[in-house]
């Protein structure tokens, strides 16, 4: 994340009433993996609805049926988890509500308590057959993501085959995971190529990584394990949002930026700017000026509007959100073309989001 | 698990300085604000300001703007806060509080001649 | 600023009663309040987030309601270590104001 020097004050001043922003954790649905399921967008008066699932657009298809306020997910995988919007467009404004969808079974990487399925994960091999590490069943390893509640049971598996036998050792970010560097330790069912870990807390999250290998080669997977407590959390921002924009000199253009806060935000509007022909200031750090902010004399600040634009408004524009808890921010770039260029939204270069937990 | 921790007490002369320390440990430090919050069996409690270590965002109640100074560093975990030109008005316990959720044990400041 | 008036000052209940805390706010904060529970010589904790919220490791006998500029805490089934003064404050807008606090006694 960027530092700043600030050509004008960005504290936490959220005076904007919260009528866009929704300030309580998402509603989780769950299913398990094959089960179909159903939501309804829980928004009133909606003239159209749009989905987005992981701020992606979300059209339908052969297991995705769209009717109305329902979005119907047919035999539901892994992949199929996330945090997912539906957005109600109305004559006059638009609102967003956020809810989670986890296809999981009873606890983490799509695995039951007793392991009962997990005979076929143990693959024997004709002994002439020498054969370097592969994977047994990609299905369950789909899911890299994990968003536990404190306290629950996680279950990381990495089924695989090959001959001779391989071995199977866990990391942690990257580094050899030990049995001390937790509470009550965890357990390693190698019969079943699973990392069981009872009870978990805020510093188990990280990167866990099985490596499984023989004399014929090694393969690894790596799952990201984020523990959610029940605590307030800092904003979360729609994932490619601002997206970058092309436009001609004198041409309008939109940046949007989707905020999810469980406490009232505070939105700005951020662009690089240059002080007394420098674009930097005395500490190295660049000078930024605050376009918009949310408050009472603001419109809708999660939108920032340009008109008539000159060459002078291209570059990085940042939507810096802060709650008390924490802050996010993400940037998109302007392109101004000359007048006889044609403007077009330019999907290939969209900045990369800061994600966060 | 998350830890704020703070010195016991510190005895200043009217007039003086003091700055205080709030170190963290149990979570990333530059991904949540510190909150200092002052106690006094008066006043209640009262928010002096806030510090975002990552880039080092302050915020200030009015009220404590001239007499708090909000510092972070970010290689020790560690959030600062100064008192200036200290008065009796100024006995009272500073807590830090990361994002109101976990706090520290509290600084007890006595400013006595 | 926006003001926070809590209410009352000291409360005196039996064990196994029911006790509620008022906090009224000078405006609309939307919800967005906190309350926090200290007991005799010891730090805050977080007790109820965003009004309605139950914070980690807390009794599931607090509860919090409330919209608009009326909120309130209802303790359930008083046990004697909820023995404590119980703080509301504004986190819609800085200045983060709190209330007065309520000091909880046990009869």
């Known amino acids: 994340r960027p530092s700043f020097s600030l050509v004008e004050d960005t504290t936490l001043e959220p005076e904007e009433p919260p009528t866009k922003y929704q300030i309580s954790q998402p509603e989780v649905y769950v299913a398990a993996p094959g089960e179909s399921l159903e939501v309804r967008c829980l928004l009133k008066d909606a003239a159209v609805i749009s989905w987005t699932k992981d701020g992606v657009h979300l059209g339908p298809n052969n297991r995705t049926v769209l009717i109305g306020e329902y979005l119907q997910i047919k035999g539901a995988t892994p992949r199929d988890s996330g945090l997912y919007a539906c957005t109600a467009s109305r004559t006059v404004d638009s609102e967003t509500w956020y809810f989670m969808v986890n296809v999981t079974d009873a606890i983490s990487s799509g695995d039951d308590e007793d392991d009962t399925d997990g005979a076929e994960d143990f693959v024997s091999e004709n002994s002439n057959n020498k054969r370097a590490p592969y994977w047994t069943n990609t299905e369950k390893m789909e899911k890299r993501l994990h968003a536990v509640p404190a306290a629950n049971t996680v279950k990381f598996r990495c089924p695989a085959g090959g001959n001779p036998m391989p071995t199977m050792r866990w990391l942690k970010n990257g580094k050899e995971f030990k049995q001390e560097h937790r509470i009550g330790g965890y357990k390693v069912r190698n019969q079943h190529w699973s990392l069981i870990m009872e009870s978990v807390v805020p510093s188990d999250k990280g990167n866990y990584t099985c490596v499984v290998e023989n004399e014929y080669g090694s393969i690894n997977h790596t799952y990201h394990l984020d523990v959610v407590e029940r605590s307030p959390h800092r904003p979360i921002l729609q994932a490619g949002l601002p997206a970058n924009a092309s436009t001609v000199v004198g041409g309008d253009v939109e940046f949007v930026c989707k905020v999810y806060s469980d406490a009232q935000p505070h939105i700005q509007w951020i662009k690089h700017v240059e002080k007394n022909g420098s674009k930097y200031g005395p500490d190295g750090l660049p000078y930024l000026k605050v376009l918009k902010h949310s408050g009472i004399n603001s419109s809708n600040a999660e939108v920032l509007a340009l008109f008539n634009v000159t060459e002078a408004d291209a570059g990085e524009y940042i939507c810096k959100v802060s709650n008390y808890i924490g802050q996010a921010n993400q940037s998109a770039w302007l392109t101004v073309l000359p007048k006889q260029q044609a403007p077009g939204r330019e999907k290939e270069i969209t900045a990369s989001p800061d994600y966060l937990e | 698990q998350v830890q704020l921790q703070q010195p016991g007490a510190e005895v200043v002369k009217p007039g003086a300085s003091v700055k205080m320390s709030c170190k963290a440990s149990?979570?990333?430090?530059?991904?949540?604000?510190i909150h200092w919050v002052k106690q006094t069996p008066g006043q209640g409690l009262e928010w002096i300001g806030a510090?975002?270590?990552?880039?080092?965002?302050?915020s200030y109640n009015q009220k404590f703007k001239v007499k708090a100074t909000l510092t972070a560093d970010k290689s020790s975990s560690t959030a600062y806060m100064q008192l200036s030109s200290l008065t009796s008005e100024d006995s009272a316990v500073y807590y830090c509080a990361r994002a109101f959720t976990y706090w520290g044990q509290g600084t007890l400041v006595t400013v006595s001649a | 600023d926006i003001l926070i008036t809590q209410s009352p000052a000291s409360l005196s209940a039996s064990v196994g009663e029911t006790v509620t805390i008022t906090c009224g706010a000078s405006e609309n904060i939307y919800g967005a309040l906190n309350w926090y529970q200290r007991k005799q010589g010891k730090s805050p904790q977080l007790l109820i987030y965003?009004?309605?919220n139950l914070a980690d490791g807390m009794s599931s006998r607090f509860s919090g309601s409330g919209s608009g500029r009326q909120y309130s805490l209802k303790i359930s089934s008083l046990h004697p270590d909820d023995v404590a003064t119980y703080y509301c404050?504004?986190?819609?807008?800085?200045?983060?104001?709190f209330g007065g606090g309520t000091k909880l006694e046990i009869k």
């Open positions: 404050q504004n986190v819609l807008s800085t200045p983060y104001t």
């Open positions: 149990g979570y990333t430090f530059t991904d949540y604000y």
């Open positions: 510090i975002y270590p990552d880039n080092g965002d302050t």
């Open positions: 965003g009004a309605t």
